[in-house]
Amino acid sequence: HTAAQDNCTCPTNKMTVCSPDGPGGRCQCRALGSGMAVDCSTLTSKCLLLKARMSAPKNARTLVRPSEHALVDNDGLYDPDCDPEGRFKARQCNQTSVCWCVNSVGVRRTDKGDLSLRCDELVRTHHILIDLRHRPTAGAFNHSDLDAELRRLFRERYRLHPKFVAAVHYEQPTIQIELRQNTSQKAAGDVDIGDAAYYFERDIKGESLFQGRGGLDLRVRGEPLQVERTLIYYLDEIPPKFSMKRLTA
């Protein structure tokens, strides 16, 4: 039992405070911002990560066409309300009592309203399309090698069950990763596709959430895969409800 094993940190979430004061000296970690206990053997929910991020000091054609109902996170960062399990609450409000409904990945799916706005349930995002453009390379990547490497990444780094990586599409320089996970498919202990996509997004931006690990070093047959643009589309089990004004804008 070496000193290295005595390191009380959260390997899957560096935005935590940990101390070995759990039962029998167990290392217990709490997310910054919410103070909620997190399970460091798996990914932390996106809601708790966003909350931690907001509490931290500020610093610095085989391709899929997204459906008309696909959402893009245009609103950016906000300080979310999370439920006791760390999931997004269906209704989110800011300090000025402006409220809106979100999906399971925390992306707004209705027009903004006031405190009277009702969000009856948290609608599940069951399909995520990650759209990447890689930097120019000498030649195109081999599609099957790229597919295998990205599937390995989601399986090993993000612990997402392979069945939830529905497809990897490639038309140089665009790569699309499709994640699909219906409510009925997600078993207890399964990583949520929304959480995996968020960890991937932060990795791609060079803002890894993992403790002490180096940044993401994506290579396909030894060739670095460097991403210069990322767009993520979210499809919900129930289509979003926006007014016509937004849809025609």
């Epitope: 029998g24 000296g25 167990r26």
Partner: antibody, heavy 116, light 107 residues
Framework: QVQLQQSGPEVVKPGASVKMSCKAS????????INWVKQRTGQGLEWIGQ????????HYNKNFKGKATLTADKSSNTAYMQLNSLTSEDSAVYFC?????????WGQGTLVTVSA | DIKMTQSPSSMYAFLGERVTITCKAS??????LSWFQLKPGKSPKSLIY???RLVDGVPSRFSGSGSGQDYSLTISSLDYEDMGIYYC?????????FGGGTKLELK
């Protein structure tokens, strides 16, 4: 190496109090919890409570609330347990143990005898 | 509180024999289980933690296994120095609770 040196045996009268010590060495005292365990002759082990010197947080077995008080002195790397209102039921060997993720290093024990 | 039921409460075994002691928790404890050996006049000795991890310096004849509610400690080939009382401890939640102990004696 990790060592926990406990204070010597105590013979006390019923109704009195006793305070025993557990001096830690070989590691950073504030990085680990100290647990206290009771062993009565011919009986099993009973968990009393846990203190974390790093933040002075503690947890007690409800059976020992009001009976045991756990403290820690960071300057001397010593954990203490005081037992109040002693009765013959409190006659036992008391162990301190440093725990991390269920792995324990134990002190040699302090024998407390409650006798009129 | 989580109740730990240990069995047998006592047993006799020959030197070289394979010995298994079991502990059943009243609810799942997520592998947060330790095993200790206690000898008269000595302090407890840690053998196994996290259900199956062997403590440094403990002979490899000791092993732990189990999951959920059911756990066991096995001594593959009993040695004379293995005589004593064995206890399991759950540390899944407060309060920590010990099993009732298993007294192991030589046949």
């Amino acid at each position: 190496q990790v060592q926990l040196q406990q204070s010597g045996p105590e013979v006390v009268k019923p109704g009195a109090s006793v305070k025993m010590s557990c001096k830690a060495s070989g590691y950073r005292f504030t990085d680990y919890v100290i647990n206290w365990v009771k062993q009565r002759t011919g009986q099993g082990l009973e968990w009393i409570g846990q203190i974390y010197p790093g933040s002075d947080s503690f947890h007690y077995n409800k059976n020992f609330k009001g009976k045991a008080t756990l403290t820690a002195d960071k300057s001397s790397n010593t954990a203490y347990m005081q037992l109040n209102s002693l009765t013959s039921e409190d006659s036992a060997v008391y162990f301190c143990a440093r725990f991390f993720e269920g792995l324990a290093y134990w002190g040699q024990g302090t024998l407390v005898t409650v006798s009129a | 509180d989580i109740k730990m039921t240990q069995s047998p409460s006592s047993m006799y075994a020959f030197l070289g024999e394979r010995v298994t002691i079991t502990c059943k928790a009243s609810q799942g404890i997520n592998n947060y289980l330790s095993w200790f050996q206690l000898k008269p006049g000595k302090s407890p000795k840690s053998l196994i933690y996290r259900a199956n991890r062997l403590v440094d310096g403990v002979p490899s004849r000791f092993s732990g296994s189990g999951s959920g509610q059911d756990y066991s400690l096995t001594i593959s080939s009993l040695d004379y120095e293995d005589m004593g009382i064995y206890y399991c401890l759950q540390y899944d939640e407060f309060p920590l609770t010990f099993g009732g102990g298993t007294k192991l004696e030589l046949k």
